[in-house]
């Protein structure tokens, strides 16, 4: 977790002097309770934005908006605190708005937005805007939080940032896998612009069940640069075993941008329709 | 422009089901999370259940938690709201919803939801 290039970040708006200063997530009003704490965030509302660095690299960054309540703890709004807990590792970041002239009431609801979040794709993160001073220990919460997952490589809008394109979005190898005679596999798919490395891994499954009964990994030199975007035929020889008829192919690429964590891409060839068994013929037509 | 059409409401008996369409156009709909949102008469608008952009994420309020079922088809640019064991309280105005921004939450929405369909009535009753 990390905050979109560190340019000044502003938080000022009419009527509000205000600053983004960095965090620990352990605001002092945990350890100072105050007696008179402001009302929680109204609306809290997350959007997926994307910006670009200085360097003109495209990150995804969580759009964090909300507004505050029209009552008269605005009075004691020192600020607030914004944090993004990533679900899958516990890594933590926040930043806190710091007021520094006092809030007053105005024709229009308070709205505050921060968009310096950068995340990562296919990730899930908690976003919470904490209003400060936090409340006593017993006092009402005056935050609001909501889950917020970020679509993978696969959205059409996050294949083009950088994260993406490092880990190879924008290939796209088009697999075709066809069944043909004698217990084989035919695997044709187009090659990256790169003189990289790439492994088919085939993992075969009987009809219903997801335990797999054959597993076996091709190994693809790297291309030449005349074939590249051109088709890589492979051919891959089964186990003979019935039943065992469900084949996903998946391919790895090694492209240089992400190594060994690069995007896989798969196909999958279902088993072939069991036709319905015809009703036996009786050997004698019954007379009656 | 964008334009949520739904469809299937009807009048059911108690314990029946029926499936809501939604056929959406006018916004890149694989971009999106939807929603399903209902108005029981003379109720307040009440979240149903929401799907991610591709379908790998879904959620539902807990008053039709593990009886309906929202689903996409993203080839067909269409929403689906699979409705079992219907209840009289499920009585209401169904609409189908885009959220505004891209993204999805988990139990209601991201952002606001910027556009909704005229809606469907369901009425259950014996």
């Known amino acids: 977790l990390r905050l979109l290039d560190h340019r000044a970040l502003v938080c000022s708006q009419p009527g509000l002097n205000c600053t983004v200063k960095n965090s620990t997530c352990l605001d002092d009003s945990w350890i100072h309770p105050r007696n008179l704490t402001p009302s929680s965030p109204k609306d809290l509302q997350i959007q997926l934005h994307f910006a670009h660095t200085q360097q003109g690299d495209l990150f995804p960054v969580a759009h964090i908006e909300w507004t505050l309540q029209t009552d008269a703890s605005i009075l004691y709004l020192e600020g607030a605190e914004l944090s993004v807990l990533q679900l899958n590792t516990n890594e933590r970041l926040c930043v806190r708005f710091e007021f520094l002239s006092k809030l007053r009431h105005h024709h229009r609801r308070w709205r505050f937005t921060f968009s310096h979040f950068v995340v990562d794709p296919d990730q899930e993160y908690e976003v919470t805007v904490h209003h400060l001073p936090k409340p006593i220990p017993d006092g009402d919460p005056n935050h609001q939080s909501k889950n917020f997952l970020v679509p993978d490589c696969e959205h059409a809008r996050m294949k083009v940032t950088t994260p993406c394109m490092s880990s190879g979005s924008l290939w796209d190898p088009n697999i075709t896998v066809e069944t043909l005679e004698a217990h084989q596999l035919r695997v044709s798919f187009t090659l990256w612009n790169e003189s990289t490395h790439y492994q088919i891994l085939l993992t075969s499954f009987p009809h219903m069940e997801n335990h797999s009964c054959f597993e076996h990994m091709h190994h693809i030199p790297a291309p030449r640069p005349e074939e590249f975007h051109q088709r890589s035929n492979v051919t891959l020889t089964l186990r003979n075993l019935k039943g065992c008829c469900r084949h996903q192919v998946q391919i790895q690429p090694f492209f240089s941008s992400c190594l060994n964590d690069c995007l896989r891409h798969s196909a999958t060839v279902s088993c072939p329709e069991m036709p319905d068994t015809p009703e036996p013929i009786p050997d004698y037509m019954p007379l009656w | 422009q964008v334009q949520l059409v739904e469809s299937g409401g009807g009048l059911v008996q108690p314990g029946r089901s029926l499936r809501l369409s939604c056929a959406a156009s006018?916004?890149?709909?694989?971009?999106?999370?939807m929603h399903w949102v209902r108005q029981a008469p003379g109720k307040g608008l009440e979240w149903v259940s929401g799907i991610s952009w591709n379908g790998g994420s879904m959620d539902y309020a807990d008053s039709v938690k593990g009886r309906f079922t929202i689903s996409r088809d993203n080839a067909k640019n269409s929403l689906y709201l699979q409705m079992n064991s219907l209840r009289a309280e499920d009585t209401a105005v169904y609409y189908c919803?885009?959220?505004?921004?891209?993204?999805?939450?988990?139990?209601?929405?991201?952002?606001?939801?910027?556009?909704w369909g005229q809606g469907t009535l369901v009425t259950v009753s014996s």
């Open positions: 006018g916004f890149t709909f694989d971009d999106y999370a």
């Open positions: 919803a885009k959220d505004r921004g891209l993204g999805y939450c988990r139990g209601g929405s991201c952002s606001s939801l910027d556009y």
